[in-house]
């Protein structure tokens, strides 16, 4: 079968090979498309409700005044010339529609380095077949699921026209110290070949580099955190940030019911005071930051105290 590609809404003429150029003609067109079940026969004498979709012209060709999605399929003509020689024509018709130029909507003006950001949503409306959307960074294709790139795609079909709307949401994690003004664009590639891609206008969000937070230091006195019963332990939370953040205290991972203070004094230490302590500095701009954890223990008389207190895990990172 000869492959024919026709644009939706445009007319299409299929020639019936071997047919006499004018009536009387012995020919028959058979259609197997989205409008038929099995084969529909159209003849030159036909004329009728099918004329709006396909009709046989005086020269034997089949005329489709405005091709639609339902006209995809097989078209066959069987003709006999004046000498009784039979000729068959066979066509496979596929249809397409080029969408409007894709657009990037809900685009971000600023991205934060080191964390996932939504760049924007690329939208293409009115394609057939569906086709695909792809993203580009500085002109080069972005590959989903690589280097902090993720793409969420959605395809919808219009209930009446049958045309497709595609949506593609791009998320990226910009590298620290990377390009401060990356250029993103999106392109639509048609489902049928031989048609070039359509590209959106580019967007250039700024990349904001968050200032790395300095560590919250926890100083324990006596050093090592080991003390005789009845002794005193002083814990001091040192935060370089300005303005000074609020400091809260934790024991064994549970907040202590105390007012905010950079210093925690534990007088007359008893067994109930033993445990792991840390402080949490809450910044208005950055959220909470926890110090390393220190272990406070009681040395029984005659017991050698450790030279340095046992220290818990790194305790760094941000509280959820």
């Amino acid at each position: 079968a000869q492959n024919i590609t026709a644009r939706i809404g445009e007319p299409l003429v299929l020639k019936c090979k071997g047919a006499p150029k004018k009536p009387p003609q012995r020919l028959e067109w058979k259609l197997n498309t989205g409008r038929t079940e099995a084969w529909k026969v159209l003849s030159p004498q036909g004329g009728g409700p099918w004329d709006s979709v396909a009709r046989v012209l005086p020269n034997g060709s089949l005329f489709l005044p405005a091709v639609g999605i339902q006209d995809e399929g097989i078209f066959r003509c069987q003709a006999m010339n004046r000498n009784g020689k039979e000729t068959k024509s066979n066509y496979r018709v596929r249809v397409y529609q080029i969408p409007g130029k894709p657009e990037i909507v809900d685009s971000a003006s600023e991205l934060t380095a080191g964390v996932p950001n939504k760049v924007g949503t690329c939208v293409s409306e009115g394609s057939y077949p569906a086709g695909t959307l792809s993203w580009h960074l500085d002109g080069k294709p972005l590959v989903p699921n690589e280097k902090g790139v993720s793409v969420k795609e959605q395809t919808r079909r219009h209930p009446e026209t049958g045309l497709f709307t595609l949506q593609s949401e791009l998320m990226v994690t910009p590298a620290r110290g990377g390009d401060p003004r990356p250029t993103f664009s999106c392109s639509f590639s048609p489902g049928l070949p031989r048609h070039r891609a359509l590209r959106t206008a580019p967007i250039q969000p700024r990349v904001w580099e968050p200032v790395p937070l300095e560590e919250v230091q926890l100083v324990v006195e006596p050093e090592g955190g080991a003390v005789a019963p009845g002794g005193t332990v002083t814990l001091t939370c040192e935060v370089p940030a300005q303005p000074s953040p609020q400091i809260h205290w934790m024991k064994d991972g549970v907040p202590l019911p105390l007012p905010p203070s950079p210093v925690l004094i534990l007088p007359e230490i008893g067994p109930q005071d033993q445990g792991t302590y840390s402080c949490v500095a809450t910044h208005s701009s950055h959220g909470p930051q926890e110090s390393r954890a220190v272990s406070i223990s009681i040395i029984e008389p005659g017991e050698e105290g450790p030279t340095a207190g046992s220290v818990g895990g790194s305790g760094l990172g941000t509280l959820a």
Epitope: R35, E37, K40, G47, G48, P49, W50, D51, S52, V53
Partner: antibody
């Protein structure tokens, strides 16, 4: 809202003529085939004539061929039926309907206009 | 010409009944059959298009089905407003032809 309003019906003598009109609104008139359907008193529905959206092609059953002519004026969103050589058996309510090709069938109908052929 | 033989020509039923009306085409008409409802003194109203599709604004108790050249209109639970005359139409070929109609009356 799609609206079809017929007019022009009335009493006419056998052999006489009458012209029916149908005013269409609420849709893009030149995108659709249009059709006349009739219904004799107490009887069923009968197709009378169809015309394609451009007005270039017209279709009739044998019962009215050469006597009735369907036409349209897309600029005026109007459909017409010229009826000549009227017979008693043409007495019916005449409906204007949108469609008539395989894409639509008939989806909207007017309220009808009564044509009585009698001496 | 394609004949559309509609049966029954009339039927009596009660509210809540399931009602089935059939049209048989004398030759293949594909899916190109519509069903209409008509009440006395009113224009026909399309219920089903292309054999099985419910027209806009038509209650879901109406449905259409097809088996070859046999077409069926079903009303799953008859309501008081459904007492009317029903017609099928084939629009696959000229002349376009209607079934003879089925009058649904109150039992």
């Amino acid at each position: 809202e799609v609206q079809l309003v017929e007019s022009g019906g009335g009493l006419v003598q056998p052999g006489g003529s009458l012209r029916l009109s149908c005013a269409a609104s609420g849709f893009t008139f030149n995108n659709y085939w249009m059709t006349w359907v009739r219904q004799a008193p107490g009887k069923g529905l009968e197709w009378v004539a169809s015309i394609d959206n451009s007005g270039d092609n017209t279709y009739y059953p044998d019962s009215v061929k050469d006597r009735f002519t369907i036409s349209r004026d897309n600029a005026k969103n109007s459909l017409y039926l010229q009826m000549n050589s009227l017979r008693a058996e043409d007495t019916a309510v005449y409906y204007c309907a949108r469609g008539g090709d395989i894409t639509t069938g008939f989806d909207y109908w007017g309220q009808g206009t009564l044509v009585t052929v009698s001496s | 010409d394609i004949q559309m033989t509609q049966s029954p020509s009339s039927l009596s039923a009660s509210v809540g009944d399931r009602v089935t009306i059939t049209c048989r085409a004398s030759q293949d008409v594909g899916i190109y059959v519509n069903w209409f409802q008509q009440k006395p003194g009113k224009a026909p109203r399309r219920l089903i298009y292309r054999a099985t599709n419910l027209a806009d604004g038509v209650p879901s108790r109406f449905s259409g089905s097809r088996s070859g050249t046999d077409f069926t209109l079903t009303i799953s639970s008859l309501q008081p407003e459904d007492f009317a005359t029903y017609y099928c139409l084939q629009f696959d070929a000229h002349p376009l032809t209607f079934g003879g109609g089925t009058k649904v009356e109150i039992k």
